[in-house]
Interface confidence: medium
């Protein structure tokens, strides 16, 4: 999906109002210094692409994030403020389910959410710079 046509200000508002709180709740009890942020993004559409990938694509080390409250709110926000997003996601979800292959190994859900917090922070910083 091409995120260039999204309403970035509205997405930022939704993130600050609810999604950020859910992400922080998920991470509560874990020190921010526990994990290094290895995923980055260079502009707003790129940040949303990475956020979508990390939130909704089950990875070999974390399969359950898409069921979390912050993921449901992220999906609703993108569907609301990115034209045509929900239509493209129906097909993408089917394709993703077909090719998903998980292997039991070290659990990385907390690390993944830590990466998401970093991506969202980068999204907001990018937004501030562009205004």
């Amino acid at each position: 999906y091409d995120f260039t046509n999204c309403d970035f200000q509205k997405i930022e508002a939704d993130y600050l109002r609810t999604i950020s709180k859910d992400l922080i709740t998920y991470m509560s009890g874990t020190k921010s210094t526990d994990f290094n942020n290895t995923v980055s993004c260079s502009n707003r559409p790129h940040c949303l692409t990475e956020i979508q990938s990390l939130t909704f694509n089950p990875t070999p080390r974390c399969a359950s994030l898409a069921k979390e409250m912050f993921a449901r709110k992220t999906k609703a926000t993108l569907a609301l403020w990115c034209p045509g997003y929900s239509e493209t996601q129906i097909n993408a979800t089917q394709a993703m389910k077909k090719r998903r292959k998980r292997k039991v190994t070290t659990n990385k859900c907390l690390e993944q959410v830590s990466q998401l917090l970093g991506l969202w922070r980068r999204f907001i910083r990018t937004l501030l710079k562009k205004q």
């Epitope: 998920y26 509560s28 009890g29 874990t30 526990d34 974390c62 399969a63 359950s64 069921k67 389910k97 998903r100 292959k101 998980r102 292997k103 039991v104 190994t105 070290t106 659990n107 859900c109 907390l110």
Partner: antibody, heavy 117, light 107 residues
Framework: QVQLVQSGAEVKKPGASVKVSCKAS????????MHWVKQAPGQGLEWIGV????????TYNQKFKGKATLTVDTSTSTAYMELSSLRSEDTAVYYC??????????WGQGTLVTVSS | DIQMTQSPSSLSASVGDRVTITCRAS??????LAWYQQKPGKSPKLLVY???RPAAGVPSRFSGSGSGTDFTLTISSLQPEDFATYYC?????????FGQGTKVEIK
């Protein structure tokens, strides 16, 4: 609602094998791991192994390698655990339980396997 | 393998008491810890996962805390239906292991 229904109690002689079933309903069977957990009489919980129904990938607790074999039948949304070369120390309640990321949100009712001569 | 050690192994308490059960991991498991309740003859029931996140339908009197190697399950006001055995379990890496259990009995 999610349900995991296990087969009934079994009494086996030492050296025999037993196959316990776990029929899943109320969710997409291939979207969750299926684990098996042992509880010997009056004892705690011990993880045996896990199978991914989407591709039948399995991994086992080292202690149960060669003892337990996990399989699935996706057409009936049923998981199976076969225990071979039964000994008295295999007498226990065996549970199937599902998970995505290693914590177990739904459990079967348990199957008591008694090994006695 | 990661060893999980629970304490105490049993405790006696009265209805209305605040009860605390601790669980220690042999190595850092961050917040990858779950708590279960098991009543005699019944299957375990998930109470808490990721150390502090309540499972669906679990009463608010149950709460989890801790990270790293030291974790706590607290029952703020013990109810008659809470007399049971409680297990911790790490969900950091295979093999997943459980604590030996804490039996909560009526005083």
């Amino acid at each position: 609602q999610v349900q995991l229904v296990q087969s009934g109690a079994e009494v086996k002689k030492p050296g025999a094998s037993v196959k316990v079933s776990c029929k899943a309903s109320g969710y997409t069977f291939t979207s969750y791991w299926m684990h098996w957990v042992k509880q010997a009489p009056g004892q705690g919980l011990e993880w045996i192994g896990v199978i991914d129904p989407s591709d039948t990938y399995t991994t086992y607790n080292q202690k149960f390698k060669g003892k337990a074999t996990l399989t699935v039948d996706t057409s009936t949304s049923t998981a199976y655990m076969e225990l071979s070369s039964l000994r008295s120390e295999d007498t226990a309640v065996y549970y199937c339980t599902r998970s995505l990321d290693g914590f177990f949100d739904y459990w079967g009712q348990g199957t008591l396997v008694t090994v006695s001569s | 393998d990661i060893q999980m050690t629970q304490s105490p192994s049993s405790l006696s308490a009265s209805v209305g008491d605040r009860v605390t059960i601790t669980c220690r991991a042999s190595e850092n498991i961050y917040s990858y810890l779950a708590w279960y309740q098991q009543k005699p003859g019944k299957s375990p029931k998930l109470l808490v996962y990721f150390a502090r996140r309540p499972a669906a339908g679990v009463p608010s009197r149950f709460s989890g805390s801790g990270s790293g190697t030291d974790f706590t399950l607290t029952i703020s006001s013990l109810q008659p239906e809470d007399f049971a055995t409680y297990y911790c379990q790490h969900h950091y890496d295979t093999p997943w292991t459980f604590g030996q259990g804490t039996k909560v009995e009526i005083k």
